[in-house]
Amino acid sequence: AGPRAPCAAACTCAGDSLDCGGRGLAALPGDLPSWTRSLNLSYNKLSEIDPAGFEDLPNLQEVYLNNNELTAVPSLGAASSHVVSLFLQHNKIRSVEGSQLKAYLSLEVLDLSLNNITEVRNTCFPHGPPIKELNLAGNRIGTLELGAFDGLSRSLLTLRLSKNRITQLPVRAFKLPRLTQLDLNRNRIRLIEGLTFQGLNSLEVLKLQRNNISKLTDGAFWGLSKMHVLHLEYNSLVEVNSGSLYGLTALHQLHLSNNSIARIHRKGWSFCQKLHELVLSFNNLTRLDEESLAELSSLSVLRLSHNSISHIAEGAFKGLRSLRVLDLDHNEISGTIEDTSGAFSGLDSLSKLTLFGNKIKSVAKRAFSGLEGLEHLNLGGNAIRSVQFDAFVKMKNLKELHISSDSFLCDCQLKWLPPWLIGRMLQAFVTATCAHPESLKGQSIFSVPPESFVCDDFLKPQIITQPETTMAMVGKDIRFTCSAASSSSSPMTFAWKKDNEVLTNADMENFVHVHAQDGEVMEYTTILHLRQVTFGHEGRYQCVITNHFGSTYSHKARLTVNVLPSFTKTPHDITIRTTTMARLECAATGHPNPQIAWQKDGGTDFPAARERRMHVMPDDDVFFITDVKIDDAGVYSCTAQNSAGSISANATLTVLETPSLVVPLEDRVVSVGETVALQCKATGNPPPRITWFKGDRPLSLTERHHLTPDNQLLVVQNVVAEDAGRYTCEMSNTLGTERAHSQLSVLPAAGCRKDGTTVG
């Protein structure tokens, strides 16, 4: 090899890099050395490139032509085929033609950002250049033609289209199976249609922040089964509907901050089983409903700061067993911390909870129940006045506790806190000073001697009358009463909550009077009126009485609204045969749903029940008796009962039975002059009519023949020989006829024969 060519006159050299940047060049230097691998021509005044200037640069791989005045993608002559990276950002290029790129057979990185490109047509990027990274950010692209990047499908890994003017993405806009990063932030996209990104099988990061997206159609991200990170910050989303997340099975991070999301729907998160971080900060959330994120069992970080969350339902975080960090800074969840217990249940792995700036005035003892493993708790930015004993005690792993408040009510109830903080070595991040009593104002709680934490008065309201659980009938007026006492003259405000949410237009009556037992103590009473109650009034009611020193929360009184049962189906009288099945219907409505019970003849111990022949079908309001017996006949009562009362309806069951003989009719032998009785004891329903026959004819009655009124007993007195014969008892009712026979034999009268033997 000959001697190394010198550096170009207008440039500087370092190794195999030639730096001709920022030299005010309007044309290429003519003496570019052949060993150049990296050529920097940026920050010049080049408006066109002479391809001939690149004839003898066999090693050239990197060309920096950014910040010039080029209006088209230049040709680098013979060098085009081996250039790997071409930087053309910040020029005046208006369009890209496929013919301009065809020669770049080795091109992997192409930066066309900050130019004047207005559209990308499917002729722009031909098959050929193995471009891995394409940057089109900061142009004026408004149109993306379908298939515009198809020519790069075998190679493209990163595509940057941020800061353009794209308003719409065609469905299946990208057929780039190797693409891992797609940046579309700072455009004007309003809607993501279903299947928009189908064809991006390998995509891992999708940036859509700072658009104007207001709707994600079902299946919007379908096909992105390998995507790990989705950025949707700074858009106009009002909800995350379930179908839009369909297909995001590998998603790790979902960034949704700075939207207008007002509700978290429970459905849909099941498609994101691997979600690790969910950012919903700076939205319009006002509440977290029960189990609204229950499907996200792998979620580790949940950021909900800067919303307007004022209500966290008990069990709102149920299912988030892997959550380690929960950020709730700058919300309005004071009520959750001051009163609720169970809001944080389910967060078994939580190690960091931040509640900075939530207007928390007091910390209830069970506020953090379920967070026994917590290591970091931030309550800074809250004008905390009191912390109940036990509030932090169960957090055995707590390493950092942030409190910054100059509003503490330094009374006997706070006395436990300073020594506990010191004993647990948690005082480092606690800035806590007294606001009351006046004698301690401005003093750190750590410098107040224990004997000064006294309760000579009770400034914070204390509940003395709790609202009581009640039951009301629909349409009635009811009232809840709550009263509290305080020794402070600080103005008192009253609020009522239903199911942990403040009733904004509550019909309440408030009054105050001097407490009888102690002239210096004021008693404040609030009465909540509920007029003409409906089922919508049902729930748990609680009063909140607040003054400058804090809020006091009453017990929760339950209101149950009832409606007396009324029948929708009543049983009817029925008549059936024995051995068949009896069916009685009975159904009732009411609130709560009435229970149906059956009785027979006023009792619950009846044959069908005893013999397990009774079957109640709760779902279709039917009462069955199988293999009906005559004993089952009677009056059946259906009673519908709920807490409002009970009603009854009766039906008579009549059981029909074909006639039959209870006792068999037997043949008889009697002597003349004796009396004989033939009994035809019959059963059946209706009771059978009995007729007697002698031979084939109806029995002729004489003064010697007597029948009981029901014909069941036939008595023949002073039997004569002519009475002998075949007697038939015929039993008849509407179901049929049964016959029984008896052969009557008559012997001569008893007496002595001449030979001394006895007759008879």
Epitope: K365, F389, K415, G423, P450, E451
Partner: antibody
């Protein structure tokens, strides 16, 4: 003048039950934490159970957990201790004690005279 | 075995100064104020010292309390025969979630 008067002690067989009462007067009962403390014959003091005012949170020594139940009736100014499944080692004088303030970690500034519970067959 | 450790006995002659110690851990004495109780023979216990060193009204200033770290002590100066009693230290224990007493120290005035 603060007064605490225990009652309900007596002889009971192992496995049996007993309910102790403590009638309080001379202070606003509903504002103070209350406890039961016992002392076995010739032994030291052992805290048994305590109950907060207001929300009536309850606390128990491990030795009685699940067997004893503390409760209070603020309207009657009375503290109770329901003792079930009694054992010989529960034999002691049971004292009712008033907390200095409303928190459980406060000292006991007033004590009753005690009631003797004897568990024996 | 008590959670708080006290010497079983102590003694002194009239006029002398006697000190009774009480040793605990970070979950009790280390995180809480300590109280001392006096139990005269055949009577109910009586609060003698609270909040480590405070005396309720009626308790003579011969009785004083102090605390350092996880140990506390009760000092009785100018010992008198009526001081002969059992003395118990007590405090809340956050690990046990309950109140704990020392085993008691029997003070004999010789």
């Amino acid at each position: 003048e603060v007064q605490l008067l225990e009652s309900g002690g007596g002889l009971v067989q192992p496995g049996g039950s007993l309910r102790l009462s403590c009638a309080a007067s001379g202070f606003t009962f509903s504002n103070y934490y209350m406890s039961w403390v016992r002392q076995a014959p010739g032994k030291g003091l052992e805290w048994v159970s305590g109950i907060s005012p207001g929300d009536s949170s309850t606390y128990y020594a491990d030795s009685v957990k699940g067997r004893f139940t503390i409760s209070r009736d603020n309207s009657k100014n009375t503290l109770y201790l329901q003792m079930n499944s009694l054992r010989a080692e529960d034999t002691a004088v049971y004292y009712c004690a008033k907390g200095l303030y409303s928190n459980p970690n406060e000292p006991f500034d007033y004590w009753g005279q005690g009631t003797l519970v004897t568990v024996s067959s | 075995q008590s959670v708080l450790t006290q010497p079983p006995s102590a003694s002194g002659t009239p006029g002398q100064r006697v000190t009774i110690s009480c040793t605990g851990s970070s979950s009790n004495i280390g995180s809480n104020y300590v109280s001392w109780y006096q139990q005269l023979p055949g009577t109910a216990p009586k609060l003698l010292i609270y909040d480590d060193s405070q005396r309720p009204s009626g308790v003579p200033d011969r009785f004083s309390g102090s605390k350092s770290g996880t140990s506390a002590s009760l000092a009785i100066s100018g010992l008198r025969s009526e001081d002969e009693a059992d003395y118990y230290c007590g405090t809340w224990d956050y690990s046990l979630n309950g109140y704990v007493f020392g085993g008691g120290t029997k003070l004999t005035v010789l």
